[in-house]
Interface confidence: medium
């Protein structure tokens, strides 16, 4: 399961953020708009979704996941480029099933190293690890057949920002589970 959970040492997770504002808590501000935004969570070392009210707040707020990661995660671009250009299976494909501790009961996919195939599993909605994909296709592109197949494989995935390429957690889409700070 989650050898790469929040408190364990990881390639990126043990490093300090690039800017001091990345350490600020997410601030939704006093206005009442519902704008999907992203912030860098100092505790989890991940960029996460939150709902921004539309005014005030602070600098730890980004319109896209990619922008957040580029700005606040040290070595992110280097790691992403390295992973995208190589055809090896990323290490997290070998992590065991980890449902996390929330109980949102979501249908997800993981790479099963025993069967060498992507399979369905039930995810609780928070925590867990990176061997966790929203679609079977995503899982296959990254773990079953990295660098192969029709499109550009990992490059396509990065371009579309479908997953968060970081240590320590699954994709943060939070269907049931917005963080209101």
């Amino acid at each position: 399961l989650s050898e790469e959970a929040d408190d364990t040492d990881s390639e990126l997770g043990s490093m300090k953020p690039l800017h001091t504002f990345c350490a600020m808590k997410a601030d939704d501000g006093p206005c009442k708009a519902m704008i999907r935004s992203y912030f860098f969570n100092m505790y989890t070392h991940q960029c996460e979704e939150f709902i921004y009210g539309g005014c005030e707040g602070n600098e730890n707020r980004f319109d896209t996941l990619e922008e957040c990661k580029k700005t606040c995660i040290p070595g992110y671009e280097k790691t992403a480029v390295k992973a995208a250009s190589g055809a090896e299976r990323p290490d997290f494909c070998f992590l065991e099933e980890d449902p996390g501790l929330c109980r949102g009961y979501m249908k997800r996919y993981l790479y099963n190293n025993q069967t060498k195939q992507c399979e369905r599993f039930v995810y609780g909605g928070c925590l867990g690890n990176r061997n966790n994909f929203e679609t079977l296709d995503e899982c296959k592109k990254i773990c079953e057949n990295p660098g192969g197949g029709s499109g550009g494989g990992l490059n396509d995935i990065f371009e579309a920002q479908k997953i968060e390429w970081h240590e320590g957690g699954p994709p943060h889409h939070h269907h049931h589970h917005h963080h209101h700070h």
Epitope: D6, T44, E97, G125
Partner: antibody, heavy 125, light 107 residues
């Protein structure tokens, strides 16, 4: 029936280490996390971390990082929690508790549903 | 780290009373909250998980509600065996954390 049976009370000197065991029975040991929680005298509960008995993978609370080691012996269905460099404020009852490692579509189980009886560790010079 | 604040810290009540204990999280935790009962010298016992699901074997006089940051544990009609300390716990993010406890005493 599910049972978690812990080792007996320990008295240790500051700077020493303690290793507490938790023997599981009545279920598939490798199918569930084992969490460790402690409780200082007259105080609340504090989560320390978990081990996945199947892989040996661990997740420790940052507060205990570098001092705690969780291990397991699957052949005897036993989890261990070792705490090193003990201080007087580590005096507490230490509990193991079971957690879910695989969700089913129908929610029929909960985390922390079974607990050991607790092991009192006293740190005193 | 997420802080959980329980109120009240202690409470005196009589058999048959309806009792409510609240737990407030420092940030939203969806419904990732559990409630435990602990008696002196014993391990905690799980009462409620996922904020409102009653654990198997727990009497139906116990109920849980809430989502996000505010949660309640209600005992509809206190029984003599219910006098104990109650804790809430969040399972939304690491480190998992517990409230400071609410001690329920006989009036």
């Amino acid at each position: 029936q599910v049972q978690l049976v812990q080792s007996g009370a320990e008295v240790k000197k500051p700077g020493a280490s303690v290793k507490v065991s938790c023997k599981a029975s009545g279920y598939t040991f490798t199918g569930y996390y084992m969490h460790w929680v402690r409780q200082a005298p007259g105080q609340g509960l504090e989560w320390m971390g978990w081990i996945n008995p199947n892989s040996g993978g661990t997740n420790y609370a940052q507060k205990f990082q570098g001092r705690v080691t969780m291990t397991r012996d699957t052949s005897i269905s036993t989890a261990y929690m070792e705490l090193s460099r003990l201080r007087s404020d580590d005096t507490a009852v230490y509990y193991c508790a079971r957690g879910i490692a695989r969700l089913q579509w129908l929610p029929t189980e909960a985390d922390f549903d079974y607990w050991g009886q607790g092991t009192l560790v006293t740190v005193s010079s | 780290a997420i802080q959980l604040t329980q109120s009240p810290s202690s409470l005196s009540a009589s058999v048959g009373d309806r009792v409510t204990i609240t737990c407030r999280a420092s940030q939203g935790i969806s419904s990732s909250l559990a409630w435990y009962q602990q008696k002196p010298g014993k391990a905690p016992k799980l009462l409620i998980y996922a904020a409102s699901t009653l654990q198997s074997g727990v009497p139906s006089r116990f109920s849980g509600s809430g989502s996000g940051t505010d949660f309640t544990l209600t005992i509809s009609s206190l029984q003599p065996e219910d006098f104990a300390t109650y804790y809430c716990q969040q399972l939304d993010s690491y480190p998992l954390s517990f409230g400071q406890g609410t001690k329920l005493e006989i009036k």
